[in-house]
Interface confidence: medium
Amino acid sequence: GCLSQLYANTFFRGGDLAAIYTPDAQHCQKMCTFHPRCLLFSFLAVSPTKETDKRFGCFMKESITGTLPRIHRTGAISGHSLKQCGHQLSACHQDIYEGLDMRGSNFNISKTDSIEECQKLCTNNIHCQFFTYATKAFHRPEYRKSCLLKRSSSGTPTSIKPVDNLVSGFSLKSCALSEIGCPMDIFQHFAFADLNVSQVVTPDAFVCRTVCTFHPNCLFFTFYTNEWETESQRNVCFLKTSKSGRPSPPIIQENAVSGYSLFTCRKARPEPCHFKIYSGVAFEGEELNATFVQGADACQETCTKTIRCQFFTYSLLPQDCKAEGCKCSLRLSTDGSPTRITYEAQGSSGYSLRLCKVVESSDCTTKINAR
Amino acid sequence: IVGGTNSSLGEWPWQVSLQVKLVSQNHMCGGSIIGRQWILTAAHCFDGIPYPDVWRIYGGILNLSEITNKTPFSSIKELIIHQKYKMSEGSYDIALIKLQTPLNYTEFQKPICLPSKADTNTIYTNCWVTGWGYTKERGETQNILQKATIPLVPNEECQKKYRDYVITKQMICAGYKEGGIDACKGDSGGPLVCKHSGRWQLVGITSWGEGCARKEQPGVYTKVAEYIDWILEKIQSSKERALETSPA
């Protein structure tokens, strides 16, 4: 279930997945929540004297058991991901941080009169992920009232340093507050020939679009269908970017589908989860567990309740079925997407709904009887 | 190209511009189309920037200033640098680029013929070097593709001009005794082509030189005929790997 408590002066030992910089424990928890494998995190609010570069370190962790040994560490804050916390799930982070310089690649600098104006500039710039504002009291006069728009490959600061009279914060695109607009177009049989930032395996262009929406540097995508001529690229979703923020003119290409990230949308922002169950499809990945259930919906529910499960395959093959139901293989991968997709008539596959804001469940707290 | 003249669109349809997109986008090297999915260039172009995803390849282009963020380009799927290439020497300066998606051939974008292994001793008389590189040693990249005709220089003679370096049989030299016409910085990886028996052949890949267009200092090129087996083997093994990694 949902574990939202934080543990002060506690550090989880082992289970390291990734380390990033975040300005506070709440943001670290958010990053853990949306990381495909992170279940636990430890954040260093204070650094030991010998390790100043570890201050603001957010250490994302995983564990087969869902827990890790706790050690006492002054200034550390630890907790759980909110992957199973329904209504508490939100990528939006509106806090601003006084006296912090969140560092990254500075790609734009302009004069603004307030922090709010700077945050708005960032929210309305396609490339901006976070910002730093120098107040009128900043020690270098030439930078006073300057708004620095920043980005990084991870979407999080490359380092964080305490600096007087600097204020930092994040873009509010994930809060659906961007005014950039939201191109919903899907281009059938067109490919974008822009710079690839990553690639994942997805069953269709809509999952590809959602993956793009939640990737820190994806602006648009091209998905190659199962009919695409190059076998190794079938069902591959190429996440793309460009300097201008817009794709180059698409190339006509049969069995390619292209479109845009929806991260600047105000109303049509998708949830970071995929409801659809794909019949005749098998998702490959690292095997977590196998149970026997009745129906693909029940398999999806089992996957959703199993916190480490990212996707599943339900098999109706005779050898995979017995009295209590058919085989439900719970799976995971490093990026949360299948490592390969194959087409099998007797299989059905889908994703965990653990990151959906409202997870429909048959376990209702109040049963309403029909009259 | 030092001492060259402007080319016209479609005159050298195999010529591509290899550009790097880091903070800004810049032309770095030339290259030659040798197949729908294959570009031949110099290995040394990738020293310092060995990351395939930052390279953009533009074909069918005459004027680099007309490239905008809407201009289509090709991305690198696979970068194959000669296994014996070491940046700390001038030898084996050859690389193959496999493109993410095959090129559509047009009158402005099509391949150049490779010589055969038997052409290692062929005497070529009508040879041209092309590129967007500097027009003088301390110059700058040119917008319009430049061309220059240039005579080949026998290796023994070339070695005499380069007492400080070793000119191997896998290199071919071209230049005028009096200097004045040569490839230069930014032309690396581009083609040295010769018309022989009525068709253009890729004889050399622009590699290095002592400055540019200096008297008694010819340009040094990778001799393509010496690498035919390597080129064919790499293209073939890439096709076989693609079959091995494809889903059942």
Epitope: - | G48, G90, D164, A183, C184, S207, W208
Partner: antibody
């Protein structure tokens, strides 16, 4: 094994001269560019001069131009630095180093220093 | 002349720490950037040439990166023998210039 051994350093008065030698072994000396680099006491490194394999081309730092001459004798596998009109600011440990070839953007240059001698101290003082 | 600015000028770190030294050129130098290590009373030793190429015999815990004006030398896990001075050097154009050096001390 590549070895470079400097000699000829010592105490000299301002305006005086010295000739440094660098004996090379363990590699084909005539195929490599050679370099002199110096380091004043407690200070950083300063490139002084450079000579091509054949000895046909030499280059100098502005601070020594016209006063120092680099030369080589490929038959003796030896590099030299003739230092004239010495000044107090020339006081330093002088290192000879071998230049490695680097090919980049159609330029083939000898410009990193892959093997160094142990150095010889030159003191210019009255 | 091209100025090479190294930072920090000195640092103190524990064995096993990750150490990063940066070098900035006053104008773009492509990848013509080399790194050297010098122990007190000894000659410098080449570590990395052409920004990212490891000289033979140099341990793989050292790595270099960068292009243009900004370069980095990283020691992934500091060892006792890594103390001393580190210098960057541009070889884009004569005069070849060195950075001011970074003194690395083991705590």
């Amino acid at each position: 094994e590549v070895q470079l051994l400097e000699s000829g350093g010592g105490l000299v008065q301002p305006g005086g001269s010295l000739r440094l030698s660098c004996a090379a072994s363990g590699f084909t000396f005539s195929a490599y560019s050679m370099i002199w680099v110096r380091q004043a006491p407690g200070k950083g490194l300063e490139w002084v001069s450079y000579i091509r394999p054949s000895g046909g081309r030499t280059t100098y730092a502005d601070s020594v131009k016209g006063r120092f001459t680099i030369s080589r004798d490929n038959s003796k596998n030896t590099l030299y630095l003739q230092m004239n009109s010495l000044r107090a600011e020339d006081t330093a440990v002088y290192y000879c180093a071998r230049g490695g070839l680097l090919l980049w953007n159609r330029e083939l240059k000898s410009n990193y220093f892959d093997y160094w001698g142990q150095g010889t101290l030159v003191t210019v003082s009255s | 002349d091209i100025q090479m600015t190294q930072s920090p000028s000195s640092l103190s770190a524990f064995v096993g720490d990750r150490v990063t030294i940066t070098c900035r050129a006053s104008q773009p130098i492509d990848n013509y950037l080399n790194w050297y290590h010098q122990k007190p009373g000894k000659a410098p030793k080449l570590l990395i040439y052409a920004a990212s190429r490891l000289q033979s015999g140099v341990p793989s815990r050292l790595s270099g990166s960068g292009f243009g004006t900004d370069f980095t030398l990283t020691i992934s896990s500091l060892q006792p023998e890594d103390f001393g001075n580190y210098y960057c050097q541009q070889s884009y154009t004569v005069p070849y210039t060195f950075g001011g050096g970074t003194k690395v001390e083991i705590r």
